[in-house]
Amino acid sequence: LEDGYKVEVGKNAYLPCSYTLPTSGTLVPVCWGKGACPVFECGNVVLRTDERDVNYWTSRYWLNGDFRKGDVSLTIENVTLADSGIYCCRIQIPGIMNDEKFNLKLVIKPAKVTPAPTRQRDFTAAFPRMLTTRGHGPAETQTLGSLPDINLTQISTLANELRDSRLANDLRDSGATIRIG
């Protein structure tokens, strides 16, 4: 679990989870639940897939990844402090006790007050460990590279959301310097 995934109130949280499709290409059922993975199934299910569809989900939860390719990464929209906690991603591989279980810790931080905009074209010194988690960021971060100026507060609040390599390219194209890893 380490330090978990930190997201500000009001932002979208992203929790990565994926599996390799069997050689048959058949999808494996997956469930996401609030709380640590129990022995079987998921507790407090927020989203579930079967061999073909996403067959259950609740209002603010959706799959950011392409589940048809085994990417079952979860997005939680517009998080509140109540969303903090452990989330279980369970890959329900057929057979007895074959399931893969992943417990992911989500930490929700209070929203920061935005100070006056500051010009900053080189993020590396200020945020040397940006973009360390694989996966895809939420939609609202994907056009960041098209903005002519990005202030430090925007960067710090988005730091936990910037996960898409395409976004890294956008930022690079905008003149920013980024170090990944």
């Epitope: 569809d53 996403v54 989900w57 990844g65 048809r68 990417d71 395409r166």
Partner: antibody, heavy 121, light 107 residues
Framework: QVQLQESGPGLVKPSETLSLTCTVS??????????WNWIRQPPGKGLEWIGY???????NYNPSLKSRVTISLDTSKNQFSLKLSSVTAADTAVYYC?????????????WGQGTLVTVSS | EIVLTQSPATLSLSPGERATLSCRAS??????LAWYQQKPGQAPRLLIY???NRATGIPARFSGSGSGTDFTLTISSLEPEDFAVYYC?????????FGQGTKLEIK
């Protein structure tokens, strides 16, 4: 109400690349759940699924066309695009963009009106 | 790739009559079959999904049945606007495939 609208050249020369764009309005384009597809229909014939792109940028193509197809996404413009390279007369068809949702995968609930692309010199 | 065979290729009926269209799959598609209606110059419109569920806004005169390899689309009493081409489509196996269509024409 979701609307999809195809646009692009109606005439393409053999061996060149066919390029079409689908503009989506009135729907949740920039969020997960929806897959954005291209489907074609040669004159007087049936329908053929070409491929999809997901919100995340993930793509999947029909094996029969995979080597020639590229589908891309521009979330800032609510658009996705199709490129089909090395076209021949057999690629003459009405090209449709269509949507499906992951709760009923591969069930195409919204379609564009279609655009006829003729491959001819 | 699953092949869907529709029959008949053309069906000639009069308004008010009952229409029965068939779709046969080369292997089982369970109940993962949809039906679409296409009028000249228009895009296909989803009528039925998963063999028997009517899509939003589709009149009750349209119904679907079947499972496995044999499916039927029934229009209980034909209205003038129902004359069109009908396609079946499977989503059981990738890639999704369509039938070649049945043309429903006015007798």
């Amino acid at each position: 109400q979701v609307q999809l609208q195809e646009s692009g050249p109606g005439l393409v020369k053999p061996s060149e690349t066919l390029s079409l764009t689908c503009t989506v309005s009135g729907g949740s384009f920039s969020r997960g759940g929806y897959y954005w597809n291209w489907i074609r229909q040669p004159p007087g014939k049936g329908l053929e699924w070409i491929g999809y792109i997901y919100y995340s940028g993930s793509t999947n193509y029909n094996p029969s066309l995979k080597s020639r197809v590229t589908i891309s996404l521009d979330t800032s413009k609510n658009q996705f695009s199709l490129k089909l390279s090395s076209v021949t007369a057999a690629d003459t068809a009405v090209y449709y963009c269509a949507r499906d949702h992951y709760s009923s995968s591969w069930t195409f609930d919204y379609w564009g009106q279609g655009t006829l692309v003729t491959v001819s010199s | 790739e699953i092949v869907l065979t529709q029959s008949p290729a053309t069906l000639s009926l009069s308004p008010g009559e009952r229409a029965t269209l068939s779709c046969r799959a080369s292997q089982s598609v369970s109940s993962y079959l949809a039906w679409y209606q296409q009028k000249p110059g228009q895009a296909p419109r989803l009528l039925i999904y998963d063999a028997s569920n009517r899509a939003t806004g589709i009149p009750a005169r349209f119904s679907g049945s079947g499972s496995g390899t044999d499916f039927t689309l029934t229009i209980s009493s034909l209205e003038p606007e129902d004359f069109a081409v009908y396609y079946c489509q499977q989503r059981s196996n990738w890639p999704p495939t369509f039938g070649q269509g049945t043309k429903l024409e006015i007798k």
